[in-house]
Amino acid sequence: RVDRCSLQPCRNGGLCLDLGHALRCRCRAGFAGPRCEHDLDDCAGRACANGGTCVEGGGAHRCSCALGFGGRDCRERADPCAARPCAHGGRCYAHFSGLVCACAPGYMGARCEFPVHPDGASALPAAPPGLRPGDPQR
């Protein structure tokens, strides 16, 4: 007889069960309906701490955390400066608007990547409009 499950009637990764008299779909967490076609609101009743935003997907809620926070619910502090993004001894600060570099003397740029020439000029390429040394990168 024909395997009716070969038509993959179950949506969103649901498991198809051919019971002979009927087809059944066993839905993954976060989905419902005869064919698992309904995406439940993963974020309903879920809170992300410290200004994080709940993102639905894959049947499980996920938090997109604000700068400086991490973990499943954004309750853990994360250091955006841990990767040492400021070059040439520049100091990285985790400002709420984005990480900020304060460059060591002799360097400039958003990541302190450009040396300042002795005459005061720099090897800075054309910067994007509005971007100045020390501006945060979000």
């Epitope: 400086g68 502090r77 040492r84 100091r91 990285c92 600060y93 985790a94 304060a102």
Partner: antibody
Amino acid sequence: QEQLVESGGGLVQPEGSLTLTCTASGFSFSSSYDMCWVRQAPGKGPEWIACIYTGDGSTDYASWAKGRFTVSKASSTTVTLQMTSLAVADTATYFCARNSGYGYFGLWGPGTLVTVSS
Amino acid sequence: QVLTQTPSPVSAAVGGTVTISCQSTESVYGSDWLSWYQQKPGQPPKVLIYQASNLEIGVPSRFKGSGSGTQFTLTISGAQCDDAATYYCQGYYSGYIYAFGGGTEVVVK
């Protein structure tokens, strides 16, 4: 809630020494900040003393503070300021403050009073 | 690095405008790493403006900062009684150096 609290102030004799402690709560120095000391003499404006950058432990001092003042990180939540050869002119309220970027102090402790007098 | 504030004291009527200037002997880092603080007796300074013109969270919009390089201004538009305090500018300089201005006392009548 992020807070700073200073302790260790009090009365000290001229030429004496004192160590002040700044204790952080609500955050730790595992992130990168300048943890700084600022003092304010009675009726005067604030005066920057020194900072320690928690990212790598490097320190910076006002030119007048070098030699007599030493800032250090004692733990993940405390920084200290050691003061030696104190003079009457060092009488002030000593504040602990945090720079979290753009070179400004967005978080301050309430201060601790140091009085140098015989 | 020396920051000079003028004038002091400054007096204003309720609803009036207060302008305080701050001049630095050398350019602050990034040309705009200059902040403004308000201080009342018995309290630590409270930041109002950072990066020359950015209003700190929770600070009323009647406070406005401007300027760059060595010359900066704090303007209080529509001054209120609660604005009576001493105001300080503070700069951050290349080499990780900080400095405060001498302060400007504001009296609101």
